[in-house]
């Protein structure tokens, strides 16, 4: 069976991942402008998040608005949306069955049962991460595919905000965390008994000399 | 020399359909977008549409998308466009434009002009 | 989509005087901004893009400035080949949009 260390480093790993992937959530970062005018005083920066955009002026004042319904966000985004939503759902399933198998809780006694559970942990943590690597990719290709494209206007140019990092660093951590879970093998049961029955087997016999 | 030659001026029929085309010379055609612009008399200047000869990717201006098909042919470095439904109010001068190699939506070079008069 | 608003549509102006010729766009449209001219007949001609850089070709006499909302073409001497039809477009963002013109016309 894999070390405590081992379980008790993927399952942090994995714990970890899953805030990143409530911060990426969060965030209004996913798509930045920067728009920069003939002088530093028009300038402003215009952030892009999945329930908010936010305008940054140059004096550092900053106005947030809530999107109005969920067609005002554009469908790459709202897809990423749902897709994180689901990932948060999941790796909280995971983290779930994580304190579930561990080694030093008590909710299972049977050893193999926990080894088991873990491993699902971990599949359950590596579902999470992927399931946040590939809208935060997506996003990123097509604000890469669009500020090379020439019939996409200045305007309409986008850079990759904060929250798409974030998101890679969560997806790395959940499926960092998720594999060492998976290598967390079931006891080996070569033994057809266990070592107490036989004992006291051949106590008893001895019995019969 | 770059240059963008146009076809000549056409006199069509309500509800019928019209190609024109924008041959270009002097440059490597597939290097810039094409852009098409109207004119109509004694008016400004309307966008129509654009598109990449690269790889045939269009962008259309509201108003313009059912009315008018942007093609390209490579072969022949020609750019084209198709109006259809035509009514009076689609008479006027289709100019093909270049965009600006760093700021495609300018236009640094312009055909002629190809005159559409729609007539009974 | 953005307005372009060139307040005067028409100008009398004589040769040797300097005119300028104003554009307002309804948004900020980031110096991404260029100036045809057009003579009766013929089609548009590339002046300025990028609101200030004047295009190869272009006489010295013609200027560009401005940032924001708010831009100029200036000409400081007016020539009788100058006498045309001047139009601003913006390019900041999809569909590009045009002034209505400034007519020059002479006294």
């Known amino acids: 069976m894999a070390s405590m260390g081992l379980q008790v480093m993927g399952i942090a790993l994995a714990v970890l991942g899953w805030l990143a992937v409530m911060l990426c959530c969060a965030l209004p970062m996913w798509r930045v402008t920067a728009f920069i005018g003939s002088n530093i005083v028009t300038s402003q920066t215009i952030w892009e998040g999945l329930w908010m955009n936010c305008v940054v002026q140059s004096t550092g004042q900053m106005q947030c608005k809530v999107y109005d319904s969920l067609l005002a966000l554009p469908q790459d985004l709202q897809a990423a949306r749902a897709l994180v939503i689901i990932s948060i759902i999941v790796a909280a399933l995971g983290v779930l069955l994580s304190v579930v198998g561990g080694k030093c809780t008590n909710c299972l006694e049977d050893e193999s049962a926990k080894a088991k559970t873990m491993i699902v942990a971990g599949v359950v943590f590596l579902l999470a991460g992927l399931m946040v690597i590939v809208p935060v990719s997506w996003t990123a290709h097509n604000i890469i595919q669009d500020f090379y494209n020439p019939l996409v206007a200045s305007g309409q140019k986008r850079e990759m905000g904060a929250s798409l990092y974030v998101g890679w660093a969560a997806s790395g951590l959940l499926l960092l965390g998720g594999g060492l879970l998976c290598c967390n093998c079931p006891p080996r049961t070569d033994k057809p008994y266990s070592a107490k029955y036989s004992a006291a087997r051949s106590a008893a016999a001895s019995n019969y000399v | 020399e770059v240059q963008l030659q146009q076809s000549g001026p056409e006199l069509v029929k309500p509800g019928a359909s019209v190609k024109i085309s924008c041959k270009t010379s002097?440059?490597?055609?597939?290097?810039?977008?094409r852009h098409w612009v109207k004119q109509s008399r004694g008016k400004s200047l309307e966008w129509i549409g654009t598109?990449?000869?690269?790889?045939?990717?269009?962008r259309y201006n509201q108003k313009f998308k059912g009315k008018a098909t942007l093609t390209v042919d490579k072969s022949s470095s020609t750019a084209y466009m198709e109006l259809r439904s035509l009514t009076s109010e689609d008479s006027a001068v289709y100019y093909c434009?270049?965009?600006?190699?760093?700021?495609?939506?300018?236009?640094?070079?312009w055909g002629q002009g190809t005159s559409i008069t729609v007539s009974s | 989509d953005i307005q372009m608003t060139q307040s005067s549509s028409s100008f009398s102006v004589s040769l040797g005087d300097r005119v300028t010729i104003t554009c307002k766009a309804s948004?900020?449209?980031?110096?991404?901004l260029a100036w045809y001219q057009q003579k009766p007949g013929n089609a548009p001609r590339l002046l300025i893009s990028?609101?200030?850089s004047l295009e190869a070709g272009v006489p010295s006499g013609f200027s560009g400035s401005g940032s924001g909302k708010d831009y100029t073409l200036s000409i400081t001497s007016l020539q009788t080949e100058d006498v045309a039809t001047y139009y601003c477009?913006?390019?900041?963002?999809?569909?590009?949009?045009f002034g209505g013109g400034t007519k020059l016309e002479l006294k």
């Open positions: 434009t270049r965009g600006i190699t760093k700021s495609p939506y300018g236009m640094d070079y």
């Open positions: 002097g440059y490597t055609f597939t290097e810039n977008i």
């Open positions: 598109i990449n000869p690269n790889n045939g990717e269009t």
């Open positions: 948004e900020d449209i980031y110096n991404r």
């Open positions: 990028g609101a200030t």
């Open positions: 477009q913006q390019y900041w963002s999809t569909p590009p949009t």
